[in-house]
């Protein structure tokens, strides 16, 4: 069964850091581009970042550029999101999603930025 | 790089025959193996993607199977329009594709 499982969320103070992970199973992870999408409480979906299958090319939303870093370890079938200089407005459920058409999603992990 | 081999390189068959072509990858490509048909002077045509999924419009006499390193394209009852060259292609290492050397199917 194709699955994505996020972890690493939690409560962090403004200015702090967190590293999210997304463990993939049931498909050939190294084939697909992967993405992070977030959803603030009661709000819509916001694309955060993408990484190509090889890991060599990355894309970021303007709102996180310079603060967040997407990466992947194809040998471990895992996608990462390193989040630095966190702000209150980064509070959201963070989902990882597969491919250009976001055809498979994880269940999400909650990130709360608050003092 | 992933290398692809096919066997046989050519075969002769009659209309109505069951034809099997095999494709082997130098390392596991999971199920990310596609098959193409090419007729002389024409561009290749995608027949089967992801090992066993028939492209829309492709007759059901074509089928694919396998996983890992060993794959098979089967034509259950060869038709006159099926005489062509067939290529396998791995899309595991996308976007850097690798094709097999091809198998030519001609009339016995």
């Amino acid at each position: 069964e194709v699955q994505l499982l996020e972890s690493g969320g939690g409560l962090v103070q403004p200015g702090g850091s967190l590293r999210l992970s997304c463990a993939a199973s049931g498909f050939t992870f190294s084939l697909y581009s992967m993405n992070w999408v977030r959803q603030a409480p009661g709000k819509g979906l916001e694309w955060v970042s993408s990484i190509y299958s090889s890991g060599g090319s990355t894309l970021y939303a303007d709102s996180v550029k310079g603060r967040f870093t997407i990466s992947r370890d194809n040998s471990k079938n895992t996608l990462y999101l390193q989040m630095n200089s966190l702000r209150a407005e980064d509070t959201a459920v963070y989902y990882c999603a597969r491919g250009r058409a976001f055809d498979i999603w994880g269940q999400g992990t909650m990130v709360t930025v608050s003092s | 790089d992933i290398q692809m081999t096919q066997s046989p390189s050519s075969l002769s068959a009659s209309v109505g025959d069951r034809v099997t072509i095999t494709c082997r990858a130098s390392q596991s490509v999971g199920t990310y193996l596609n098959w193409y048909q090419q007729k002389p002077g024409k561009a290749p045509k995608l027949l089967i993607y992801a090992t066993s999924n028939l492209r829309s419009g492709v007759p059901s006499r074509f089928s694919g199977s396998g996983s890992g390193t060993d794959f098979t394209l089967t034509i259950s009852s060869l038709q006159p329009e099926d005489f062509a060259t067939y290529y396998c292609q791995q899309s595991y290492s996308i976007p850097r594709f690798t094709f097999g050397p091809g198998t030519k199917v001609d009339i016995k």
């Epitope: 084939l31 697909y32 993405n35 999408v37 979906l45 694309w47 993408s50 190509y52 299958s53 060599g56 090319s57 894309l59 939303a61 491919g99 250009r100 058409a101 976001f102 | 990310y32 596609n34 193409y36 290749p44 995608l46 993607y49 992801a50 999924n53 492209r55 292609q89 899309s91 996308i94 976007p95 594709f97």
Partner: antibody, heavy 118, light 108 residues
Framework: EVQLLESGGGLVQPGGSLRLSCAAS????????MHWVRQAPGKGLEWVSG????????WYADSVKGRFTISRDNSKNTLYLQMNSLRAEDTAVYYC???????????WGQGTLVTVSS | QYELTQPPSVSVAPGQTARIICGGN??????VHWYHQKAGQAPVLLVY???DRPSGIPERFSGSNSGNTAALTITRVEAGDEADYFC???????????FGGGTKLTVL
């Protein structure tokens, strides 16, 4: 109807240059990775180069790296292949093809012949 | 940056047809993907590249796209279709994914 139409092929001397074009229609060109695949006379298929939807990412076969440049103009729905320092072994029919969401090259052009000879 | 506009809510009776629209400048030249998200769950892809359905998605869900409006049509609406619906495109100028604001579908 999805269509891909290559142009720009011809006869060129070794060391020379050519620019191939591929005009796309019938689909959302800017949503797809696009590729060039070539076929030498009487030989099999060889992947040459690929490009991401925005053109930000490009990939090349080792045999053409440093000599060929792939690009695209999404406003014109056109894919390009700039070929420099051409060699006899680059002689082939060059096809452009669309990558269908990582599941094979589902549409191909009719090809354009490039002949490198003195 | 490219913007997509969706109505905040749509209401429909069971068995009827719901049409959820997504507006964007010349959206007809782009490929639109549609998702639904039920309360407390992750989004699910319903339609990709304007009109194509992933395996497992019922034919009741269909997409269209032309001019400045894309639409998701749900026929024979069921109570279980109640969810938030999001459209999405890739902004080819900057290679950014863009989502619409979402439409809450209420089944009366």
């Amino acid at each position: 109807e999805v269509q891909l139409l290559e142009s720009g092929g011809g006869l060129v001397q070794p060391g020379g240059s050519l620019r191939l074009s591929c005009a796309a229609s019938g689909f959302t060109f800017s949503d797809y990775d696009m590729h060039w695949v070539r076929q030498a006379p009487g030989k099999g298929l060889e992947w040459v180069s690929g490009i991401s939807p925005s053109g930000g990412w490009t990939w090349y076969a080792d045999s053409v790296k440093g000599r060929f440049t792939i690009s695209r103009d999404n406003s014109k729905n056109t894919l390009y292949l700039q070929m420099n320092s051409l060699r006899a072994e680059d002689t082939a029919v060059y096809y452009c093809a669309r990558d269908w969401y990582s599941s094979g090259l589902d549409y191909w052009g009719q090809g354009t012949l490039v002949t490198v000879s003195s | 940056q490219y913007e997509l506009t969706q109505p905040p809510s749509v209401s429909v009776a069971p068995g009827q047809t719901a049409r959820i629209i997504c507006g964007g400048n010349d959206i007809g030249s782009k490929g639109v993907h549609w998702y639904h998200q039920k309360a407390g769950q992750a989004p699910v892809l319903l339609v990709y590249d304007n009109t194509d359905r992933p395996s497992g998605i019922p034919e009741r869900f269909s997409g269209s796209n032309s001019g400045n409006t894309a639409a998701l049509t749900i026929t024979r609406v069921e109570a279980g279709d109640e969810a938030d619906y999001f459209c999405q495109v890739w902004d080819s100028t900057g290679e950014h994914a863009v989502f619409g604001g979402g439409t809450k579908l209420t089944v009366l």
